[in-house]
């Protein structure tokens, strides 16, 4: 069928709660493309009816909720004008007690389930909640060993638990819980996080280093498509978020209507002492309003920008 196969890493998920996976593979999904989800090489696409427990929601596949029998390989087919890519995602579902956050024995757990706090520092844990816009998430509650976390050292800020003056006793099994509302129905989302404590400042200290961009301008013709990578080195155990912003707003939110400028999916390469992260920004069509505006790459406390400028006229 001429589609190029791309295999994603396994996702390990908890039964009886919502789960969503977004089919994005930049730069493939940055232009005019159609996305269709399938299960286990079935010829029949996943339903787009929002009342279905499993359905496609724009580029997402959404499980409301995930069930034991949903394990398997899912494919999303991305068709462009001149291209076709088939992305394979292996989903493994496991049973979990409500407060049971000790999931370290499972193979290939993603970094979302294993996080690190730095001893003596003010640090944070992140509750990774990836859902389409049709899902509304309520405030997040945090637990440790099945009990609610409280105390002056702990502050809940959006999807993060801020921990001031991290101590060795902050290691252990945490869970973050949120209520998700979709089409008037409510579901509970509970993510387990195994937390360890490190004294290491790690590679280049604990502040992420933005390799590119370097606060510079880029010459680009009006109307062209442009993709710019933000390359960041950071410790292997970091909990920093990396993103692109404009006017202090996430680009995906700022251009929510037109979707003309989008942030790509983050990738990373592991080295012995650190990770190299890449997250791109795609301008589907550069417009006049984009020139002179700083587009900021953020990585934890570090920032760097690019400014688009029109090429100088060629008088030859």
């Amino acid at each position: 069928d001429g589609c190029k196969d791309i295999f994603m890493k396994n996702e390990i998920l908890s039964a009886s709660q919502p789960f969503a996976f977004n089919c994005t593979f930049p730069p493939i999904t940055s232009g005019e493309v159609s996305v269709t989800w399938y299960k286990n090489s079935s010829k029949i696409p996943v339903s787009k009816i929002i009342q279905s427990r499993i359905h496609q929601d724009e580029t997402w596949i959404l499980f409301l909720p995930m069930e034991w029998g949903d394990s398997g390989v899912y494919q999303c087919v991305i068709k462009g004008r001149d291209s076709c890519h088939r992305i394979h995602v292996n989903l493994t579902v496991f049973e979990k007690h409500w407060c049971d956050t000790s999931i370290g024995g499972l193979p290939n757990l993603s970094d979302e389930y294993k996080q690190i706090l730095h001893l003596g520092k003010d640090d944070s844990l992140t509750c990774h909640l990836h859902f389409p816009k049709s899902c509304v998430l309520g405030p997040i509650k945090w637990y440790k060993d099945c009990n609610e976390i409280k105390g002056e050292r702990f502050t809940v800020l959006e999807t993060r638990l801020l921990v001031s003056n991290v101590s060795a006793e902050d290691r252990g099994n945490y869970a973050c819980q949120a209520i998700l509302t979709h089409s008037g129905k409510q579901y509970e989302v509970l993510n387990g996080i195994t937390v360890s404590i490190t004294e290491r400042a790690g590679y280049g200290g604990s502040v992420p280093k933005i390799i590119y961009p370097k606060n510079h301008s880029i010459e680009v013709q009006l109307g062209t498509t442009l993709i710019v990578d933000c390359n960041v080195t950071d410790t292997k155990d970091n909990t920093n978020l990396r993103c692109w912003r404009v006017n202090n707003t996430l680009v995906d939110d700022y251009y929510d209507e037109s979707k003309r400028i989008r942030e790509g999916v983050e990738t990373h390469v592991s080295f012995r002492e650190h990770n190299l992260y890449t997250v791109n920004i795609t301008f589907l069509e550069v417009k006049m309003e984009d020139y002179g505006l700083p587009f900021m790459c953020h990585a934890g406390v570090s920032t760097a920008y690019i400014i688009l400028q029109l090429p100088a006229p060629d008088f030859r």
Epitope: H97, D145, N147, G172
Partner: antibody, heavy 116, light 107 residues
Framework: EVQLQQLGAELVRPGASVMLSCKVS????????MNWVNQRPGQGLEWIGM????????RLNQKFKGKATLTVDKSASTAYLQLSSPTSEEYAVYYC?????????WGQGTLVTVSA | DILMTQSPSSLSASLGERVSLTCRAS??????LNWLQQAPDGTIKRLIY???SLDPGVPKRFSGSRSGSDYSLTISSLASEDFVYYYC?????????FGGGTKLEIK
């Protein structure tokens, strides 16, 4: 180093109440739950209840309602268990155990003897 | 309340022997289970946290595992100081409950 200090023994008259203390050092007292557990002579361990020093939220084993009261003194980093009108049934060793992670650290225990 | 059934209640074994103690939970507790050791003077020490995580300073001969609702503490090679009492403790839901205990005796 984390330490939970308890007195070795308390003698109490029947019908009088007794207050057991557990002084904490080595961690942020107001950040984690504190448990109380007892053990009658030759018996196993039994959970009495727990308290969070930050806001004094208490969860008590139904079996000890009306018998046990949990309190804290944040300034002294000390947790207390008060036993009201103890009888020979309350003759036991009482342990405090902190849940920095679940029941991570234990006090040495206080032996409560009820005697006229 | 969740009932924790611990077996055996007593066990005679020799130095260097491998032994396993078991606790069965009457309801789902996930991995929210600890193993505790109680010395003759009454001192209690946690050995295993969250079913299988070994506490710092605890010898590697101790290990914890789970099969369904059965939880095991295994001592791979008994040392003289291991002949004491052991308890399991579930902290999945209150009231938290303990197993009845196992007295490990030297043969």
């Amino acid at each position: 180093e984390v330490q939970l200090q308890q007195l070795g023994a308390e003698l109490v008259r029947p019908g009088a109440s007794v207050m057991l203390s557990c002084k904490v050092s080595g961690y942020f007292f107001t950040s984690y739950w504190m448990n109380w557990v007892n053990q009658r002579p030759g018996q196993g361990l039994e959970w009495i209840g727990m308290i969070h020093p930050y806001d004094s939220e208490t969860r008590l084993n139904q079996k000890f309602k009306g018998k046990a009261t949990l309190t804290v003194d944040k300034s002294a980093s000390t947790a207390y268990l008060q036993l009201s009108s103890p009888t020979s049934e309350e003759y036991a060793v009482y342990y405090c155990a902190s849940s920095t992670t679940a029941f991570a650290y234990w006090g040495q225990g206080t032996l409560v003897t009820v005697s006229a | 309340d969740i009932l924790m059934t611990q077996s055996p209640s007593s066990l005679s074994a020799s130095l260097g022997e491998r032994v396993s103690l078991t606790c069965r939970a009457s309801q789902d507790i996930g991995n929210a289970l600890n193993w505790l050791q109680q010395a003759p003077d009454g001192t209690i020490k946690r050995l295993i946290y969250a079913t299988s995580s070994l506490d710092p300073g605890v010898p590697k001969r101790f290990s914890g595992s789970r099969s369904g609702s059965d939880y095991s503490l295994t001592i791979s090679s008994l040392a003289s100081e291991d002949f004491v009492y052991y308890y399991c403790l579930q902290y999945a839901s209150s009231p938290y409950t303990f197993g009845g205990g196992t007295k490990l005796e030297i043969k």
